[in-house]
């Protein structure tokens, strides 16, 4: 029988009546065009919905937009279009929602062709009131909030000016011209690239990287010959053109650009790219594109300085710059990432790492699953996960993989079971242990979401026909109940739940179509009465993450420590609640050589855990710059993996080598950097 369909499933009693009392319909009295939805703040219940309708006329486009506000998680909406003077809002800028619980919202309006500047509507009270502000420029990008101070905004203009506001968009000042890319750093610092003569495109590779720490009063040039830059965790990266040719190389700084080191990564040519796949304060995953139009590259993982890189995964699927990659951080378990590789026969296979890129393996075949037509051996195959690439290829995949930090161990994804990703209609699979083991959760493609920190999973079948049924599970996807939320089926367009998976409300969005008209409609279902009581101590059980062999003393050790979690028992039907905090207990492991990566000039031969000196570097000057100047690099060949907390055990102490090196970087050394004031 299909997953969750057997009669032994733990049934939730009287759920139809409980859900019927908590199902709220809202019909939007405007025409169906596009709809965008934003949550304002955390646990506030405030949702803004912007509906837009375009009529392309011969000479111009006539547009109409409406703004709606809910303060009860979408159960009721109020038309607040009059608060923005019935102005047409530009959807390409979306709704710029302020960080944390600032309650700030910026909407960018459409203005007539001849106007001097753009127009925004600003709210700092969770969209209860808006203030209209006319801008002295036409915005090119959405307003960007400083992560540290939501009153500080920056924007680029259509004329490449960098504009800053210090009073939440009331007053704006152009702090620099000829700007290509700007980003907030930490402590209200702004980094941006600027061109000298031509344009952003023409000067690519000849840009300068600037920094201001005082919102434009003074500037410091921190890089030249810049192609691009990026921020990840505590690292600032710049790709810099080489002197001799058209290749470029990554440089990294951990002090906001004051000093730079050359990353020990391959240089790339004009048609190649670098991409930061993931970064935290410990390390970074970097993709380096292969030469030629291969559609793949190599993943490297960094040391704690962002300088030394270990090859992590070959033939990593990444189609083009800004294209598609399936790289996914499984946020429900530390150290776990999933991605796709392009094999020699051009089939796509899923790989998973449990130790932050140290080793990659195929996903274990789900229990009770048959291998599909892609499998050479019908008894041995793997699960392959559909992610961004499959979605871009218009396969029947409505959603990317889903995991939430507060729903420990749970990963939900579309997949197929075989030797590679299949173009057949996928099923939905779930893992409750962070990707080690999988089971089929639902037959066929579905939309899915996690509520109440994993206490409820909700799903809706992906169908071209109108739907009126929602499925839900209170036991991590083992058993499913179905609920008919409306008599009149709707054309489904999306599931919306508050980010963070703490809510117990789900909104089903769609439209109804009649003979002459179609209207937006939403149904919000509150599951609070399904989970009638608050969870108690007896509802939780203890679980050891990353456990693969209990007989092994170091079972569960990943990056030098193991973690035990209190997890909700599958049979417990209760509320984790909005204030639920994951309870975990770490314990330190003994060190082994696996806890160390090879330092600069060293490598690990295949199937060996010892680091040995790279023969080609013996007695040679190294094309490597540390902190932008010539200096001696001393190393014993080992460096602890970033984030590794092991203690005792193996301590790879040996003779410290002195690697004499000549700095061959053409990048800025501190003495070449200059400062300017406005």
């Amino acid at each position: 029988s299909a997953p969750g369909e057997d009669e032994e499933c733990g049934r939730v009693r009287d759920f139809v009546a409980k859900l019927a009392n908590n199902t709220h319909q809202h019909v939007f009295d405007d025409l169906r065009g596009s709809v965008s939805l934003s949550w304002v703040g955390d646990s506030t219940g405030v949702i803004l919905v912007l509906t837009t309708f375009h009529v392309p006329l011969v000479i111009m486009t006539f547009g109409q937009s409406k703004l709606y506000r809910s303060e009860d998680y979408g159960k009721n909406f109020k038309d607040i279009t009059d608060l923005i003077n019935n102005t047409f809002i530009r959807t390409e800028f979306g709704m710029a929602i302020g960080p944390e619980n600032s309650g700030k919202v910026v909407l960018t309006a459409e203005v007539s062709g001849g106007s001097r500047g753009g127009r925004i509507f600003r709210s700092s009270d969770f969209a209860k009131n808006f203030v209209q502000t006319d801008l002295p420029f036409h915005p090119l990008t959405q307003m960007m909030y400083s992560p540290q101070n939501s009153d500080y905004l920056l924007a680029l203009s259509t004329e490449n000016g960098l504009w800053v506001s210090k009073n939440f968009g009331g007053k704006w000042e152009e702090i620099h011209k000829a700007v290509c890319l700007a980003k907030w750093g930490s402590d209200n610092t702004i980094f941006f690239t600027t061109y000298a003569n031509g344009s952003c495109k023409a000067d690519l590779g000849a840009l300068e990287l600037w920094r201001t720490s005082d919102l434009g009063k003074s500037f410091k040039t921190i890089g030249v010959k810049i192609y691009s830059f990026g921020l990840g965790g505590r690292f600032l990266f710049a790709s810099v053109m080489a002197d001799k040719d058209t290749t470029r190389r990554i440089h990294v700084s951990t002090d906001q650009g004051d000093t730079w080191s050359m990353a020990q990564l391959p240089s790339v040519g004009q048609e190649q790219f670098y991409s930061i796949l993931a970064a935290n304060d410990d390390m970074v995953f970097m993709h380096v594109d292969e030469p030629g139009d291969t559609g793949f590259g190599t993943i490297f993982t960094s040391d704690d300085r962002g300088i030394v890189y270990s090859k992590s995964l070959d033939r990593h699927l990444y189609t083009t710059t800004g294209g598609e990659t399936d790289f996914t951080n499984v946020t429900s378990l530390r150290g776990v990432y999933i991605t796709s590789v392009l094999s020699e026969d051009n089939s796509i296979q899923t790989m998973i790492t449990f130790d932050q890129g140290g080793r990659w393996t195929h996903l274990r075949k789900p229990e009770n699953s048959e291998c599909d037509a892609t499998a050479k051996n019908k008894n041995e195959c793997s699960l392959h996960i559909h992610a961004s690439y499959s979605i871009s290829q218009k396969l029947n995949v409505p959603m990317a993989p889903l995991s939430e930090p507060n729903a420990v161990g749970i990963v939900i994804a579309h997949g197929s079971v075989g030797d590679a990703i299949s173009v057949m209609v996928p099923d939905v699979y779930i893992s409750d242990d962070g990707g080690y083991s999988w089971t089929k959760m639902l037959e066929g493609p579905h939309y899915y979401t996690i509520l109440d920190s994993g206490g409820i999973i909700v799903a809706i079948e992906h169908s071209s026909r109108p739907i009126n049924v929602i499925k839900f599970s209170t036991d991590e996807g083992q058993c499913w109940q179905t609920y008919t939320f409306t008599r009149d089926p709707i054309y489904f367009t999306g599931l919306a739940s508050e980010p963070g998976a703490r809510s117990m409300n789900i909104s089903i969005w769609g439209f109804t179509e009649s003979f002459l008209t179609s209207q937006w409609v939403s149904y919000t279902i509150d599951f609070k009465d399904i989970l009638e009581r608050n969870c108690e101590e007896k509802d939780y059980t203890i679980w050891l993450a990353h456990s693969t062999d209990p007989a092994d003393y170091e079972d569960g050790c990943i990056l030098g420590y193991k973690e035990q979690f209190l997890r909700l028992r599958k049979s417990s039907v209760c509320q984790n609640g909005r204030d639920y905090v994951v309870t975990k207990q770490p314990s330190i492991c003994l060190c082994s050589l696996e806890d160390f990566l090879c330092d600069f000039g060293y490598y690990r031969p295949e199937n060996d855990s010892k680091c040995v000196e790279q023969p080609e570097l013996k007695g040679h000057d190294l094309e490597f710059c540390l902190y932008g100047r010539e200096e001696h690099l001393t190393t014993n060949g080992y460096r602890k993996i970033p984030g590794d907390k092991c203690q005792g055990g193996v301590n790879p102490v040996r003779e410290v080598k002195d690697l004499k090196k000549k700095c061959t970087s053409n990048f800025l050394s501190p003495e070449k950097q200059n400062s300017k004031s406005n």
Epitope: E8, C9, G10, R11, G409, D433, S437, D475, Q478, C479, K538, T541, I542, W543, L544, A545, H546, S547, P550, A551, D552, Y553, D555, G556, K562, Q564, R569, K570, S571, S572, Q585, S587
Partner: antibody, heavy 124, light 106 residues
Framework: QVQLVQSGAEVKKPGSSVKVSCKAS????????ISWVRQAPGQGLEWMGG????????NYAQKFQGRVTITADESTSTAYMELSSLRSEDTAVYYC?????????????????WGQGTTVTVSS | DIQMTQSPSTLSASVGDRVTITCRAS??????LAWYQQKPGKAPKLLIY???SLESGVPSRFSGSGSGTEFTLTISSLQPDDFATYYC????????FGGGTKVEIK
């Protein structure tokens, strides 16, 4: 082969406490939960509680909450069960048992290794 | 706590008989059920875990089935060594045992 060896029989007065030990040998003590189960004469099995040596996470059956304390000493691979405010109904054979484990869940796979049992007699 | 009801409490059978013992949980426990055999004066011995998985070293005449709330232990052909008391135990809530089933010689 894993073995659990329990301390010897005890005779106790009502109102007093008893502490029974359970020493593991021949396996990884720290990675498994240890449960304590008792059996009164002619009666069935009754779970009292358990402990995971790593982190010392203990949990108890509601019936014994407040009266039983389960501890573990990783360095000696020994688990302890202390039962206080003894009454005559506490006369039983007390077993420690290792919870088998195939995944990260500690208590879900049955008790695969048992101690020989410790007889506790409560009598005035 | 979850209650476990075992039946019958006593069962008389002969060598070679097929014996079935049932266990009912007061609420769904998925497949988290174990079966034990206990002989007088001895500690219990694990036979089955996760409702139907046979513990290593246990003869294949023992089998378990069921999920949710209804479970059975079957001895396909009773042997002289099998006369004992059998307990079921749920592991999804705080652990609880069934009352036991004594299998005696007819």
């Amino acid at each position: 082969q894993v073995q659990l060896v329990q301390s010897g029989a005890e005779v106790k007065k009502p109102g007093s406490s008893v502490k029974v030990s359970c020493k593991a040998s021949g396996g990884t003590f720290r990675n498994y939960a240890i449960s304590w189960v008792r059996q009164a004469p002619g009666q069935g099995l009754e779970w009292m509680g358990g402990i995971i040596p790593i982190g010392g996470w203990a949990n108890y059956a509601q019936k014994f909450q407040g009266r039983v304390t389960i501890t573990a000493d990783e360095s000696t691979s020994t688990a302890y069960m202390e039962l206080s405010s003894l009454r005559s109904e506490d006369t039983a054979v007390y077993y420690c048992a290792r919870q088998g484990r195939k995944t990260g869940y500690y208590y879900y796979y049955g008790m695969d290794v048992w101690g020989q049992g410790t007889t506790v007699t409560v009598s005035s | 706590d979850i209650q476990m009801t075992q039946s019958p409490s006593t069962l008389s059978a002969s060598v070679g008989d097929r014996v079935t013992i049932t266990c009912r949980a007061s609420q769904s426990i998925s497949s988290w059920l174990a079966w034990y055999q206990q002989k007088p004066g001895k500690a219990p011995k694990l036979l089955i875990y996760k409702a139907s998985s046979l513990e290593s070293g246990v003869p294949s005449r023992f089998s378990g089935s069921g999920s949710g709330t209804e479970f059975t232990l079957t001895i396909s052909s009773l042997q002289p060594d099998d006369f004992a008391t059998y307990y079921c135990q749920q592991a999804d809530g705080h652990i609880t045992f069934g009352g036991g089933t004594k299998v005696e010689i007819k």
